[in-house]
């Protein structure tokens, strides 16, 4: 069998601080060196590259400077953590993995992870 | 909106050499991997080659390995296909072409012909 | 690599029947495309991850099948569908395509 099956959780609600984490894991087909992992957001059949980084196996996950998201790997396994998340980014998030080198190229598409956010509610005013 | 358009081809002797372009816009370039897919006159589609993101990572068909290099500069938004030793097996319409999101060719470029021939 | 076959190689209807065109693979995967093709244009995506529509495609296409075995269904044909249909893996490389159906007017 030539396809790669990728997992992740089917829910996550994020953190009152805007921030969820998820593992992606991948059943990996041959010895991949280097592998890109990239989270898609999906809502009203709109879909968004949210970030993407490529590691060497056995790194860290390097994402860009500015980049909301954030991970670890070990072995066939990525922790990503998406921050500064706000109600209106509740959406389902896709882990995209792709087995770029040595060859053969495998791609493997998660079925996505509903993230849900809730904007903490404003603190009252206190009367000191 | 996504558009890609290619240039370069033309009638070359074989054994000679062509350099295909494809200049991109309207999407983040470097965020795509980019094919290279050919038909031969009357036959079906047959994929060439591909490079990933910042271009480090590049897969050939066999039939043009050793011959053909794909290459693409990011900082202009074009893809490029070096075409050495060519044959008369080789003519063909090439069409550049994006990989989605989700992995297939989302978008196609309108083509250009290259013929072998002496 | 994963061989894509097609069948048939033409397909000969109306205007309005329904058009069934098989894709079978060498190998099993998830990751299977179809693409419409006109005469002198680019090929057009048309369904991705063997049953997803891609943007802007009519719901009168559609994709099922899942491991070897893939169909593409159009129903209803329109004079515009008339054309050559392929299929693609797109999950490993290299990239292959099956040989094509003609899908011509009776």
């Known amino acids: 069998c030539k396809a790669m099956h990728v997992a992740q959780p089917a829910v996550v609600l994020a953190s009152s601080r805007g921030i969820a984490s998820f593992v992606c894991e991948y059943a990996s087909p041959g010895k991949a060196t280097e592998v890109r992992v990239t989270v898609l957001r999906q809502a009203d059949s709109q879909v968004t590259e949210v970030c993407a980084a490529t590691y060497m196996m056995g790194n860290e996950l390097t994402f860009l400077d500015d980049s909301i998201c954030t991970g670890t790997s070990s072995g066939n396994q990525v922790n990503l953590t998406i921050q500064g998340l706000r109600a209106m980014d509740t959406g389902l998030y896709i882990c995209k993995v792709e087995l770029m080198y040595p060859p053969p190229y495998y791609l493997g598409i998660g079925n996505g992870t509903q993230i849900y956010v809730i904007d903490p509610e404003p603190c009252p005013d206190s009367d000191f | 909106q996504v558009q890609l358009v290619e240039s370069g081809g033309g009638v070359v002797q074989p054994g000679r050499s062509l350099r295909l372009s494809c200049a991109a816009s309207?999407?983040?370039?470097?965020?795509?991997?980019i094919h290279w897919v050919r038909q031969a006159p009357g036959k079906g589609l047959e994929w060439v080659a591909v490079?990933?993101?910042?271009?480090?990572?590049?897969y050939y068909a066999d039939s043009v390995k050793g011959r053909f290099t794909i290459s693409r500069d990011n900082s202009k938004n074009t893809l490029y296909l070096q075409m050495n030793s060519l044959r008369a097996e080789d003519t063909a319409v090439y069409y550049c072409a994006r990989a989605g999101n989700w992995g297939p060719f989302d978008y196609w470029g309108q083509g250009t012909l290259v013929t072998v021939s002496s | 690599e994963i061989v894509l076959t097609q069948s048939p190689d033409t397909l000969s209807l109306s205007p309005g029947e329904r058009a069934t065109l098989s894709c079978r693979a060498s190998?099993?995967?998830?990751?299977l495309a179809w693409y419409q093709q006109k005469p002198g244009q680019a090929p057009r995506l048309l369904i991705y991850g063997a049953s997803s529509r891609a943007t802007g495609i009519p719901d009168r296409f559609s994709g099922s099948g899942s491991g070897t075995d893939f169909t593409l269904t159009i129903s209803g044909l329109q004079p515009e569908d008339f054309a050559v249909y392929y299929c693609?893996?797109?999950?490993?490389?290299?990239?292959?395509f099956g040989q094509g159906t003609k899908v011509e007017i009776k």
């Open positions: 693609q893996q797109y999950g490993t490389s290299p990239w292959t």
């Open positions: 190998q099993s995967t998830n990751y």
């Open positions: 309207g999407f983040t370039f470097s965020s795509y991997g």
């Open positions: 490079i990933w993101y910042d271009g480090r990572n590049k």
